[in-house]
Amino acid sequence: IVNGSDCQKDAQPWQGALLLGPNKLYCGAVLISPQWLLTAAHCRKPVFRIRLGHHSMSPVYESGQQMFQGIKSIPHPGYSHPGHSNDLMLIKMNRKIRDSHSVKPVEIACDCATEGTRCMVSGWGTTSSSHNNFPKVLQCLNITVLSEERCKNSYPGQIDKTMFCAGDEEGRDSCQGDSGGPVVCNGKLQGLVSWGDFPCAQRNRPGVYTNLCEFVKWIKDTMNSN
């Protein structure tokens, strides 16, 4: 997250981190039920660990943290690497969470976001596009949902109904490492961090997010059948 601020501890209890090796964060994720996460489909890896209830970027133990393995990764069937359409994936964890003030699921919005809606995006991704600057703790940023027209003008030929754009003034954006993390609007999960221009946080190049209202049925059906 570029030019965000430290999230309040436990204010994003649905925020997850996907880790490679012992503690190498590569994507965010969102807890949507006691045993299921959502993340971006482009975050799919054969082996990874899941960390919930953690505030710090560092591997230091925190009392609220819970660690999991992914036992099933189900990318949306319409996703094709390295494209951006249908960029979501369900992850079933090896056990259910212990519900606590640090770890709680978030409800998915059934209605699509409208232009001007204020939302919160969060993550431990890079704080600049130099790729080496990471935050000490989870970062939060208020962003505004942009019109479809403005979104398409920003990225001609690249936007479809499975995406929405959101941003703020130049210099504020999600960035590398935030993928799969939550965009929460009015207390409900509206989107997942997906893509945007590189470097992040450029003028008239907003972040692009997976439009989860288009996938509510697929998410429910997939969870029920697995």
């Epitope: 971006a40 094709s80 390295p82 999600s174 490492g177 961090v193 221009d197 470097p199």
Partner: antibody, heavy 126, light 107 residues
Amino acid sequence: EVQLVESGGGLVQPGGSLRLSCAASGFTFSSYSMNWVRQAPGKGLEWVSYISSSSSTIYYADSVKGRFTISRDNAKNSLYLQMNSLRAEDTAVYYCARDLTSMQSRDYYYYGMDVWGQGTTVTVSS
Amino acid sequence: DIQMTQSPSSVSASVGDRVTITCRASQGISSWLAWYQQKPGKAPKLLIYAASSLQSGVPSRFSGSGSGTDFTLTISSLQPEDFATYYCQQVPIFPYTFGGGTKVEIK
């Protein structure tokens, strides 16, 4: 079959210009970032330039900045390198290479160049 | 710019030998290192990405390790087709930079 084929190399005098092309086939070209990499005779690999899938992000090596221009035409599945003010030290085999990393995607994960062309030779000499 | 230093610059080995090539970055690059193999007159071929992940179709005798600034490419049992030049490349930061190469020759 996934393939990249370069063309446009040749002999050119110092100060002259050349335009290299790279024709892509067997994959969705418009989804991938692309690079030019060169190799001087008997030397190692040197990265020259990068262009994102939508052409919105472009980078150059300092050694070619201001002289070379990378571009692409997704409708034609083609990558280009316009080389102006050529110098003797630009003599090399030039490869186009597909970048497996999408810099637009916001994961923190980087791959490398997974598909390379056979190369085209550029000789700058008087 | 990040400098990539490979060693040794050349190594003589026999079929069946274990060969280790090292690559050092001038600053930390996490695990974002790729290894390539190049044979004379041919284009480079991606062997390993993200320091230790084997590219599809690459034999399992090739392995990579390391993180931060120090990385290693190992060929567990050298085969005749492995005699080539090997390059490391850092991929997270522009300008992309390659190591100087390590030539694996027949002893």
